[in-house]
């Protein structure tokens, strides 16, 4: 294991559990997750006498790192005293030290809620010359609190004498005001009110009001996936609105059909993103027949922050149709990864671009998360292509060495699916993929090279192939014809297949 510095935690009792007449008390310090040994724990007991005992380090089973506890027992007027536990770990660095200062016991307390309020913009999105931020620290058990204002994480030099505290019943509230120039506020900096209380930190942050032009807002309306449409027979379309500024006003998504017929009940999901924006998704079930017959569905979006409504519409893609060609391959063994292999599936020359790709093993569809499939890209011709990649483990291929790549596409016949099987070890030199429907022994050669397996086209020859008589000098079964692919500028690949 590599060198790891410890995490240090104070160990205290609840004050209410210590008898008021106790003459001595014990507190502790936990250093955990460090490697290698040792740590040195020392205590600063102020004016009091104390005895310390550091327990032998124990090994954390999962990581192999260490943990140790140091105990301090003090007597006398301990109630008002603060104690410092100092942990040094020289393997991390000669001056690595972590100090924790705390009292003998922890009181039950209600933590504060911290909320920043800001002076409002006018309706046109304009800001006054100065902007006030008010930090409300409310609902905490009375006690000392420290308020600090930060600008982009840096402590600001603010007069905190204006902070006022009030008490309501058993809880207290404090507020602190920060006045900013318009220039500072518009600079898009983040302002934070940081409150320290009972050794804990609580905070809230804010930036300038959402721009009156929420420029990033985008909306997208998806078509149903071919898998949902043709296999599950429960197609859905999804209206996605991204980069909304969170606000009191909600996004309103309304579904309609160009025909004027009623729509089904939709489901809605809102998600706050890490960048602070809101993403809203509405999913509408559509009728398989309605979709196939060309119905147009519309998603209308309104929001208080959008000057105009917006509408997205979707319908079945028009234009020529072409079924996908599916080719599956296994990569050769790679040094250092004997127990894992990558399977690849090339699906090409399909139109339109809507396609679903699945991998199956043991007649069971593998979860989508197992494979990675590219977005459809245009070929040099008029069609589209995708690649799909699946990593498989030795355990899987030893259980059954056949994996199926399946494409679901509206132009594929007879059942909107085309699939190819691929084996990690097809039992032939050079190990490549075989068609799911190909005979057991399919060989090909390109003039000079013999014995290289190739993905055969199943029971229908490749369109650029012509069929010839079976060759007696080939090791394949004599009843198979020979299919020769006409290739420009290179020796033609030939392979046996059912013509």
């Amino acid at each position: 294991a590599s060198t790891q510095s410890p995490s240090v935690f104070p160990l205290t009792r609840c004050c209410k559990n210590i008898p008021s007449n106790a003459t001595s008390v014990t507190l502790g310090c936990l250093a955990t997750g460090y490697f290698p040994e040792p740590v040195m724990v020392t205590w600063d007991t102020g004016s009091l006498n104390g005895t310390t005992m550091t327990l032998p380090a124990t090994t954390l089973t999962l990581s192999g790192h260490y943990a140790t506890i140091s105990l301090l027992t003090v007597s006398g007027a301990w109630a008002k005293q603060m104690f410092t536990c100092r942990v040094a770990h020289t393997p991390s660095s000669t001056d690595w030290v972590d100090n924790k200062t705390f009292s003998v016991c922890s009181r039950d307390f209600t933590p504060p809620t911290v909320k920043i309020l800001q002076s409002s913009c006018d309706g046109g999105g304009h800001f006054p010359p100065t902007i006030q931020l008010l930090c409300l620290v409310s609902g905490y058990t009375p006690g000392t609190i420290n308020i600090t204002w930060l600008e982009d994480g840096q402590v600001m030099d603010v007069d905190l004498s204006t902070a006022s505290t009030t008490q309501e019943g058993e809880l207290a509230s404090t507020q602190s005001e920060l006045t900013l120039s318009q220039k500072h506020w518009l600079s898009d900096r983040t302002y934070t009110c940081q409150v320290t209380y009972q050794g804990h930190t609580f905070e809230d942050s804010t930036k300038k009001c959402a721009d009156s032009n929420p420029r990033g807002v985008s909306a997208y309306l998806s078509r149903p996936s071919p898998f949902d449409l043709f296999i599950r027979k429960s197609p859905t379309i999804t209206c996605l609105v991204v980069d909304l500024a969170p606000s009191k006003g909600t996004v309103n998504l309304t579904w309609s059909r160009a025909s004027g017929k009623p729509v089904n009940h939709s489901t809605r999901k809102e998600e706050k993103q890490r960048n602070g924006t809101l993403t809203v998704t509405s999913t509408l079930p559509v009728g398989t027949r309605d979709w196939i017959e060309g119905e147009t569905y519309q998603c209308r979006v309104t929001h208080p922050h959008l000057p105009r409504a917006l509408m997205r519409s979707t319908t079945k893609t028009s234009g020529p149709r072409a079924a996908p060609e599916v080719y599956a391959f296994a990569t050769p063994e790679w040094p250092g990864s004997r127990d894992k292999r990558t399977l690849a599936c090339l699906i090409q020359n399909f139109m339109p671009e809507d396609i679903s790709v699945q991998w199956l093993h043991n007649e069971v569809q593998l979860p989508d998360a197992r494979h990675s499939t590219t977005q459809p890209r245009k070929t040099k011709g008029s069609g589209f292509f995708v690649f799909s990649r699946l990593e498989v483990t030795r355990a899987e291929w030893e259980q059954k060495d056949e994996f199926i790549c399946r494409a679901v596409h509206e132009a594929a016949s007879p059942s909107q699916t085309v699939q190819r099987a691929v084996s990690v070890n097809p039992g032939l030199a050079g190990g490549s993929a075989q068609s799911q429907r190909a005979p057991d022994r399919v060989l090909c050669h390109s003039g000079q090279q013999q014995g290289l397996p190739r993905a055969a086209g199943g029971s229908v020859p490749h369109p650029r192939c012509h069929c010839g008589a079976g060759r007696a000098d080939w090791p394949g079964p004599p009843e198979l014809d020979v299919c020769v692919e006409e290739a420009e500028g290179e020796a033609p690949w030939t392979w046996t297949g059912l013509c």
Epitope: G123, N213, V217, T302, H303, P304, P307, A309
Partner: antibody, heavy 119, light 110 residues
Framework: QVQLVESGGGLVQPGGSLRLSCAAS????????MTWVRQAPGKGLEYVSI???????WYANWASGRFTISRDNSKNTVYLQIDSLRAEDTATYYC?????????????WGQGTLVTVSS | DIQMTQSPSSVSASVGDRVTITCRAS??????LAWYQQKPGQPPKLLIY???TLASGVPSRFSGSGSGTEYALTISSLQPEDFATYYC????????????FGGGTKVEIK
């Protein structure tokens, strides 16, 4: 059928104020975002302000401060208040309806009301 | 702000001519480019919306094309009633700006 009728224009002295009204009929006003567009004599179209179905409003930068858009759906009317009028505000002011599904432009316009600012 | 630049500012053409007017946006428009026709003394009339969709009652000789920042209005065979001024407009749902409309293109009789 859809109709938008502007009123309130006329001759006004520089520094004066005007309140333009736009009476809407033949459709449900509350379902539409509404816009004011102006056109100075012999010049092109110039966007002034938009008010969305929630009553929130936006202005061209030059219009912010002196122009105020508002709507009263119960009266089927949209308003444009213009203060501190200047000679360059002389124009025909059109009230216009954004398409219901939005982001598609203006599908209906009023005939316009002429505002002349002159001493 | 998205600025709309229309060209040419005027064009002289004859009946039957094919006329193309272009409109360039200072940044990409993801929805809502519209084209209007205006005749003297009248309000503008919507011809094309959403870049390329013909408004109701507009003859099929009018067509709109383009994406991103470059757009065009084409009149395939100019008719006498088509002599007018044409404006492009961005009606993007997430923006409002000073220059929503292009400067206009006057189509005159040659």
């Amino acid at each position: 059928q859809v109709q938008l009728v502007e009123s309130g224009g006329g001759l006004v002295q520089p520094g004066g104020s005007l309140r333009l009204s736009c009476a809407a009929s033949g459709f449900t006003l509350s379902n539409h975002d509404m816009t004011w567009v102006r056109q100075a004599p012999g010049k092109g179209l110039e966007y002034v302000s938009i008010i969305n179905t929630y009553g929130n409003h936006w202005y061209a930068n030059w219009a912010s401060g002196r122009f105020t858009i508002s709507r009263d759906n119960s009266k089927n009317t949209v308003y444009l208040q213009i203060d501190s009028l200047r000679a360059e505000d002389t124009a025909t002011y059109y009230c216009a309806r954004e398409t219901h599904h939005g982001s598609s432009g203006i599908d209906h316009w009023g005939q316009g009301t002429l505002v002349t600012v002159s001493s | 702000d998205i600025q709309m630049t229309q060209s040419p500012s005027s064009v002289s053409a004859s009946v039957g001519d094919r006329v193309t007017i272009t409109c360039r946006a200072s940044q990409s428009i993801y929805s809502g480019l519209a084209w209007y026709q205006q005749k003297p003394g009248q309000p503008p009339k919507l011809l094309i919306y959403d870049h390329s969709t013909l408004a109701s009652g507009v003859p099929s000789r009018f067509s709109g094309s383009g994406s991103g920042t470059e757009y065009a209005l084409t009149i395939s065979s100019l008719q006498p009633e088509d002599f007018a001024t044409y404006y492009c407009q961005h009606a993007d749902y997430a923006h409002h700006s000073d220059n929503v409309f292009g400067g206009g293109t006057k189509v005159e009789i040659k």
